[in-house]
C-alpha cells in the first residue's frame, strides 16, 4: 500500500476508491508541481505503464479510463514529463479495490461443545466479496430483552460467562462491507439444547476365537449427559458404502458394541453422539481401523447376509493364542489410531 | 439508566492529533459493544468505528488508518485517537452502544474543528 507518499497534486477515482467489481471506473491524476508545465501525464497500474483511454482533460489533469475493472486489488500512481527533467517526477498514488456487496449469511448455527465454555456460532458467507467484510453476531436475550454484539471475520466463540442472565436467546448475523449490508435470518437459541457431549473417542477393538468371530469395539466420553443417543458407522477399506447402527449409551462406562464382520478384512469404524433428542451431532470420531482374524481352516465361514450388532457388556480376553498346526492364522493385528485432522462436519469419509 | 459523556474535542491543525474518551455508566460496560459516530455541519450522522466486548474493531473507509477505537472496562471508557486529521473530519462527535449504525440516543457530544 501507499498510506504515506508525498503528493505533488491529487489523484482521486471515481465511483470511489472500493467499488464494485465490473464497474467502470475513471481515475483523475491532477498535478501541482512547481517549476514544471508537464509534456504528459503517465498512469501506472501495479507499476506498469498504461498504454490506453487516457485523456488529458487540460494542462494540470488527465483522466484514465477502465471498462469493467475486475481486479480485486490494484495500486495506481501518476507521473509528469517534465521539460529538463531526465526521469518522471512521481504526482501521487492510490490502492483501488473492486469487490461485492456481501450475501445474507445463511446456515447460521450455534453450538456449546460440553466443558468448552463457549457457544460457537458458525455461518455460510456466500460468495467472495474481495474486499473487508465484517460480521457482527448480535445475540438478545428473549428474557431480559438486552442485546450484545460480537464482532467476527467467519465464525464467533461467545463465553458462556457473559449468557449467565437468561437460557433463551435470539441470533442473527449482519455482513458489512464498504458495498453494502445483509442480515441473515434469525436463530431462537435455548442454551440446555444446543450442547454437544464431549468427544467420543474409539480406544480399542477385539475380535473373538469362538465359532463365530465376533469383534467388540470399545468406546468411551468424558460427558456428564446422562441421556446420550450415538451412531457408530463402519466400512471394510475397500468398501464406498458406510453401514450405521444407532445406540443409546450410558457413558458412566466404556461402552462395548458386537459387530459380526467378514474375516481376514480391514474395517474402519467411527461414531458420534447428540444428546439424547436434541439437534446438534458431535462431528466424527477419528477413523480407527481394525483388522478381523483370518478364518481357521477347519471353518467354513459363512458370512452374514446382513452384518448385525449390539450391544454387551460382557467381558471379552483379547485374542492372543496361536493355533499350532497354523500358527499365523490367529494372529490378532493390533488396531491403530490414524491420528490426522478428518474433514470437518458430519459427512467425513474415509477411502 | 444509560449515561454516556463525551469529552476531548478540540480545535486542531491539519494533520494534528486528538483523543476523545466517553465515559459510560448505567449498563453492564464489560458486556456491551460501542461505537462512535460523528455530524459534519449541514449533514447527516455518518457511522466511525465499532469494538465489541472483546476489542475486536470496524472503521469507516474514511477514517481506516487514522483513527484507533479502544475501551477500558476498568474504567468504563471507550476512546477513539484521532491522527492524521483532515478538515473533512470536522464535526461533532458521539459515542453510543453497539458496534454499528449511525444513530445516537441524545448524548451531548464532543466538538471536533480541524483548521489551519
Known amino acids: 500500500g501507499i498510506t504515506s507518499i508525498n503528493c505533488s497534486g491529487d489523484m482521486w477515482v471515481e465511483p470511489g476508491e472500493i467499488f464494485q467489481m465490473g464497474m467502470n471506473v475513471s481515475i483523475y491524476c491532477q498535478e501541482a508541481l512547481k517549476h514544471c508545465r508537464p509534456r504528459n501525464l503517465y498512469f501506472y497500474k501495479n507499476g506498469f505503464k498504461e498504454e490506453f483511454d487516457i485523456t488529458r482533460i487540460n494542462r494540470t489533469t488527465a483522466r484514465i479510463w477502465y471498462k469493467g475493472f475486475s481486479e480485486p486489488h490494484a495500486y495506481m500512481h501518476c507521473t509528469a514529463e517534465c521539460p529538463g527533467h531526465f526521469q518522471e517526477t512521481l504526482i501521487c498514488g492510490k490502492d483501488i479495490s473492486s469487490g461485492h456487496p456481501p450475501d445474507a449469511p445463511s446456515n447460521l448455527t450455534c453450538v456449546i461443545y460440553e466443558y468448552s465454555g463457549n457457544m460457537t456460532c458458525t455461518w455460510n458467507t456466500g460468495k467472495p466479496t474481495y474486499i473487508d467484510t465484517k460480521y457482527i453476531v448480535h445475540v438478545k436475550s428473549l428474557e431480559t430483552e438486552e442485546e450484545q454484539q460480537y464482532l467476527a471475520s467467519s465464525y464467533v466463540k461467545i463465553s458462556t460467562d457473559s449468557l449467565q442472565g437468561s437460557r433463551k436467546y435470539l441470533v442473527w448475523v449482519q455482513a458489512v462491507n464498504s458495498l453494502g449490508m445483509e442480515n441473515s435470518q434469525q436463530l431462537h437459541v435455548h442454551l440446555d439444547d444446543i450442547v454437544i457431549p464431549s468427544a467420543s473417542i474409539i480406544s480399542r477393538a477385539e475380535t473373538t476365537n469362538d465359532t463365530v468371530p465376533k469383534t467388540i469395539v470399545y468406546w468411551k466420553s468424558k460427558t456428564m449427559i446422562e441421556k446420550v443417543f450415538c451412531e457408530m458407522r463402519y466400512k471394510t477399506t475397500t468398501n464406498q458404502t458406510w453401514s450405521v447402527k444407532e445406540f443409546d449409551a450410558n457413558f458412566t462406562y466404556v461402552q462395548q458394541s458386537e459387530f459380526y464382520l467378514e474375516p481376514d478384512s480391514k474395517y474402519v469404524f467411527q461414531v458420534r453422539c447428540q444428546e439424547t433428542g436434541k439437534r446438534n451431532w458431535q462431528p466424527w470420531s477419528s477413523p480407527f481401523v481394525h483388522q478381523t482374524s483370518q478364518e481357521t481352516g477347519k471353518r467354513n465361514w459363512q458370512p452374514w447376509s446382513s452384518p448385525f450388532v449390539h450391544q454387551t457388556s460382557q467381558t471379552v480376553s483379547q485374542v492372543t493364542a496361536k493355533s499350532s498346526h497354523e500358527p499365523q492364522k490367529m494372529e490378532m493385528l493390533s488396531a491403530t489410531i490414524f491420528r490426522g485432522h478428518p474433514a470437518s462436519g458430519n459427512h467425513q469419509d474415509i477411502g | 439508566q444509560v449515561q454516556l459523556q463525551e469529552s476531548g474535542g478540540g480545535l486542531v491543525q491539519p494533520g494534528g492529533s486528538l483523543r476523545l474518551s466517553c465515559a459510560a455508566s448505567?449498563?453492564?460496560?464489560?458486556?456491551?459493544?460501542m461505537r462512535w459516530v460523528r455530524q459534519a455541519p449541514g449533514k447527516g450522522l455518518e457511522w466511525v468505528s465499532g469494538i465489541d466486548s472483546r476489542g475486536s474493531t470496524i472503521y469507516a473507509d474514511s477514517v481506516k488508518g487514522r483513527f484507533t477505537i479502544s475501551r477500558d472496562n476498568a474504567k468504563n471508557t471507550l476512546y477513539l485517537q484521532l491522527n492524521s486529521l483532515k478538515t473533512e473530519d470536522t464535526a461533532m462527535y458521539y459515542c453510543?452502544?453497539?458496534?454499528?449504525?449511525?444513530?445516537?440516543?441524545g448524548s451531548q457530544g464532543t466538538q471536533v474543528t480541524v483548521s489551519s
Open positions: 448505567g449498563f453492564t460496560f464489560r458486556l456491551t459493544a
Open positions: 453510543a452502544q453497539g458496534v454499528y449504525g449511525d444513530t445516537y440516543s
